[in-house]
Interface confidence: low
């Protein structure tokens, strides 16, 4: 594993995989990022999803002092989204197109989370909200919201790993 006993991760490997995640997250729903289809005054309903915030130690100083805080936060987020992408929200109707990148995105989230999971140590994972929309149209709306917040999350994670690879790699 990349973080045996809580040591530094394989920053370069993590950087490469997180960049791939960014690409996949954009291709999974390309219009989410560069165009805002909400109306003025719409509220973002992303309170339930993990965000990387100022106190999470993901700034350059925090990463230098103890990268584990930030890596734990990223790991929690990856597991959270991995569970969501494997849930009925994405597996139910309407079925994804056969060549949809969501499957690859799901696998890559799992791959990066495994890179960050220390051997024999299990970080607490955030509970995923019990979302079981009954209508296909509700699922689609949830997919958009999840992919929008996932794009933001992996963009920050990719910046963290790029910084780590450039400055913290042995």
């Amino acid at each position: 594993r990349a973080v045996p006993g809580g040591s530094s991760p394989a920053w370069t490997q993590c950087q490469q995989l997180s960049q791939k995640l960014c690409t996949l997250a954009w291709s999974a729903h390309p219009l989410v990022g560069h165009m805002d289809l909400r109306e003025e005054g719409d509220e973002e309903t992303t309170n339930d999803v993990p965000h990387i915030q100022c106190g999470d130690g993901c700034d350059p100083q925090g990463l230098r002092d103890n990268s584990q805080f930030c890596l734990q936060r990223i790991h929690q987020g990856l597991i959270f989204y991995e569970k969501l992408l494997g849930s009925d929200i994405f597996t139910g109707e309407p079925s994804l197109l056969p060549d949809s990148p969501v499957g690859q995105l799901h696998a890559s989230l799992l791959g990066l989370s495994q890179l960050l999971q220390p051997e024999g140590h299990h970080w607490e994972t955030q509970q995923i909200p019990s979302l079981s929309p009954s209508q296909p149209w509700q699922r689609l709306l949830l997919r958009f919201k999840i992919l929008r917040s996932l794009q933001a999350f992996v963009a920050v994670a990719a910046r963290v790993f790029a910084h780590g690879a450039a400055t913290l790699s042995p």
Epitope: H29, P30, L31, V32, M35, D36, L37, R38, E39, E40, P94, S95, L96, L97, S100, P136, W137, L140, L141, R143, F144
Partner: nanobody
Amino acid sequence: EVQLVESGGGLVQPGGSLRLSCEASALTSFSNYAMYWVRQAPGKALEWVSAISRAGSNTYYADSVKGRFTISRDNAKDTLYLQMNSLRSEDTGVYYCAVDSSGTWRGQGTQVTVSS
């Protein structure tokens, strides 16, 4: 069951116009959803053409159709429209209205053929 039904396609000469419609039936809240037009040219992948926000105040276009196509919607009629002007041969394809940009949830489509 929710259905999206497109109409208005046909054969038109280059430079001509068509107006596509898409009626959403059995959908109680059409106005809750941003809507898209996507198209598939013969032998090519599905591509998004245009998008419109829920109330219609925000509209977006692929570069290839900008200035020629206009998307609109009538939430009272649960209907989406695409006005296509100055049509070119490369606009030929099956046009679908969809609830997502990748066309996962879409209608059966309407054929547009631009040819002299």
